[in-house]
Amino acid sequence: HKCDITLQEIIKTLNSLTEQKTLCTELTVTDIFAASKNTTEKETFCRAATVLRQFYSHHEKDTRCLGATAQQFHRHKQLIRFLKRLDRNLWGLAGLNSCPVKEANQSTLENFLERLKTIMREKYSKCSS
């Protein structure tokens, strides 16, 4: 069976996000992957989208992330743009209205995105074979 075009877009966006660090990719997010054994795929995507939404809602105008130079400001705006695109596509793939995120574990945004990229690539390899 064919891979969803949304999945390809998600992987492309994750590649863009994980290639370069910004001032705020070292900030922490809820690590939904730490204990996700009894979670369905759709729930995982939904919860990942929720985590990303929480992050960009909280940090979009964070002065620490916006930085002191126009260059840093530009990079943060690009980061937020990609996170919003990723959020939107994950919701589309999840097909759920809402999902709880209660984990206490934290990971950096950078590590969170790398883990999500691994999961998405595994999903892509299954659906493309």
């Epitope: 863009s16 290639e19 126009a70």
Partner: antibody, heavy 123, light 106 residues
């Protein structure tokens, strides 16, 4: 494809203001994913970044030139400009304009450059 | 300001030789490091971006490596058309170019 072209006087007198314009063709200067920069190269020497201007109109300047540099953009003409005040012979150089940034990356190098224009500071 | 120290400043090699240029940053710049080629009378051309990525259309004999403060640019088999000056450039915090390396044929 996108092209950049510098224009302006090739000779400027000491203490006056050097003014150059970069015209962008084959694409819009208004994309929020890209930014625009000026780089110079004195004869027989290396490259020196002068400054950059972003979609929002915000700018970054080389700290060593900051007090003398102004970069502005005119979206209606698809142009951006450089003004360098109080010039001396040390400002004699080839001046390049360039595009940075990317739509599919957080940031990218200056990947498209103009051909450069030689500016001589002399009385 | 971040300083970029490039070496050697010039080198002479034979066609087919492996050529290596190094660039050292005065502080950690992650992978925000580019390599440009400039031929006499021409504008610089981007060859490698983010330390190791080959720009579209650039021959595969050009490569880059490194992260943090130490970076290397390699031409695996020098060709006559590679005669040029090569510059590294950091864009981690604003922009700084290395001093350049002039590559000549023996």
């Amino acid at each position: 494809q996108l092209q950049l072209q510098e224009s302006g006087p090739g000779l400027v007198k000491p203490s006056e203001t050097l003014s150059l314009t970069c015209t962008v063709s084959g694409g819009s200067i208004s994309s929020e994913s890209y930014y625009w920069g000026w780089i110079r190269q004195p004869p027989g020497k290396g490259l020196e970044w002068i400054g950059s201007i972003y979609y929002s109109g915000s700018t970054d300047y080389n700290p060593s030139l900051k007090s003398r540099v102004t970069i502005s953009v005119d979206t209606s003409k698809n142009q951006f400009s450089l003004k360098l005040s109080s010039v001396t012979a040390a400002d004699t150089a080839v001046y390049y304009c360039a595009r940075g940034g990317a739509s599919d990356r957080i940031d990218h190098a200056f990947d498209i450059w103009g051909q450069g224009t030689m500016v001589t500071v002399s009385s | 300001d971040i300083q970029m120290t490039q070496s050697p400043s010039s080198l002479s090699a034979s066609v087919g030789d492996r050529v290596t240029i190094t660039c050292q940053a005065s502080q950690d710049i992650s992978n925000y490091l580019n390599w440009y080629q400039q031929k006499p009378g021409k504008a610089p051309k981007l060859l490698i971006y983010d330390a190791s990525n080959l720009e579209t259309g650039v021959p595969s004999r050009f490569s880059g490596s490194g992260s943090g403060t130490d970076f290397t640019f390699t031409i695996s088999s020098l060709q006559p058309e590679d005669i040029a000056t090569y510059y590294c450039q950091q864009y981690y915090d604003l922009y700084t170019f290395g001093g350049g390396t002039k590559v000549e044929i023996k």
